[in-house]
């Protein structure tokens, strides 16, 4: 039975040209995290395997930095980066947990972080 919960940074906004940390956290389970995949709609951004380290998709390699932790730092933001991002936690023995983050990249300096929220 899957008892875990993914906590994410929720709905967030950031300024064009700036950086943002995409972060998820898996709690309420003793399952071992073997890998975390980061995806934007149907595009793979990065993979972090607990043993094998990071894979960064070449289309993002100049703008994505691994970490902190299992998170991902997205740099040099453009308005085209607006959209949904997913952290997909592969765990043993539970299986797969998915968290969602919505990022809005703003032209002006009115960007502010949204509240953290949980996805069961």
């Amino acid at each position: 039975m899957m008892t875990g919960t993914i906590e994410t940074t929720g709905n967030i906004s950031a300024e064009k040209g700036g950086s943002i940390i995409l972060q998820c956290h898996l709690s309420s389970t003793t399952a071992q995290v073997t890998q975390v995949n980061w995806e934007q709609q149907d595009q793979l951004l990065a993979i972090c395997n607990a043993a094998l380290g990071w894979h960064i998709s070449p289309s993002f390699k100049d703008r994505v930095a691994p970490g902190p932790g299992l998170g991902l730092t997205l740099q040099s933001l453009t308005v085209n980066d607006t959209g949904e991002y997913f952290c997909i936690y592969h765990t043993y023995p539970d299986g797969t947990y998915t968290g969602r983050i919505f990022l809005e990249v703003l032209e002006s300096s009115v960007a502010e972080h949204g509240a953290r929220f949980q996805i069961p």
Partner: antibody, heavy 119, light 107 residues
Framework: EVQLQQSGPELVKPGASVKISCKTS????????MHWVKQSHGKNLEWIGG????????SYNQKFKGRATLTVDKSSSTAYMELRSLTSDDSAVYYC????????????WGQGTSVTVSS | DIVMTQSHKFMSTSVGDRVNITCKAS??????VAWYQQKPGQSPKLLIY???YRYTGVPDRFTGSGSGTDFTFTISSVQAEDLAVYHC?????????FGGGTKLEIK
């Protein structure tokens, strides 16, 4: 120039073990993971597992877990794969392979080591 | 485990022809797919990574495309030296898995 030099062919008896080496040169050994791939009948490729030489962390294909052990010797920049309790199904060519920088695709391969299990 | 299926074990083609080799994943693997060429008696050689990126030094007649479950490897104009087995591989999730290989034969 990156090179992965594997040990020579092995003829072993059923039930025995084999340990294959992969000596690397031309890059910083601890900065890249090392993987092992089995090729049976000259065609089908199977990923056995990978090891992070920096911290010894391993990821195995469950099919081989318990029978395969991946290790490294950082002082000689050499990776090893030991396979135990061999049967005729283990007769194959075994490759070590190194992925790229922040990329899991395997861009450098050893020349392969032929293992024949026969009584 | 994710199964990678290369439906054609053999493909016969002529020099100068365009050839498409397909690979289907049993579940979505985004763009985490590589293609390797293996000539007789040699080790596999990386041609395409992340579904569509040509590896350093690979001739531009080799291209890759696809995302999700369906992937295609294309040789735009086959040369005699392209006689080989072509393997697809997913690295979306361990265990990394390969297709069964497609042997390209030159008529």
């Amino acid at each position: 120039e990156v090179q992965l030099q594997q040990s020579g062919p092995e003829l072993v008896k059923p039930g025995a073990s084999v340990k294959i080496s992969c000596k690397t040169s031309g890059y910083t050994f601890t900065e890249y993971t090392m993987h092992w791939v089995k090729q049976s009948h000259g065609k089908n490729l199977e990923w056995i597992g990978g090891i992070n030489p920096n911290n010894g962390g391993t990821s195995y294909n469950q099919k081989f877990k318990g029978r395969a052990t991946l290790t490294v010797d950082k002082s000689s920049s050499t990776a090893y794969m030991e396979l135990r309790s061999l049967t005729s199904d283990d007769s194959a060519v075994y490759y070590c392979a190194r992925p790229g920088w922040y990329n899991y695709a395997m861009d450098y391969w050893g020349q392969g080591t032929s293992v024949t299990v026969s009584s | 485990d994710i199964v990678m299926t290369q439906s054609h074990k053999f493909m016969s083609t002529s020099v100068g022809d365009r050839v498409n080799i397909t690979c289907k994943a049993s579940q979505g693997v985004s763009t985490a797919v590589a293609w390797y060429q293996q000539k007789p008696g040699q080790s596999p050689k990386l041609l395409i990574y992340s579904a569509s990126y040509r590896y350093t030094g690979v001739p531009d007649r080799f291209t890759g495309s696809g995302s999700g479950t369906d992937f295609t490897f294309t040789i735009s104009s086959v040369q005699a030296e392209d006689l080989a087995v072509y393997h697809c591989q997913q690295h979306y999730i361990t265990p990394w898995t390969f297709g069964g290989g497609t042997k390209l034969e030159i008529k």
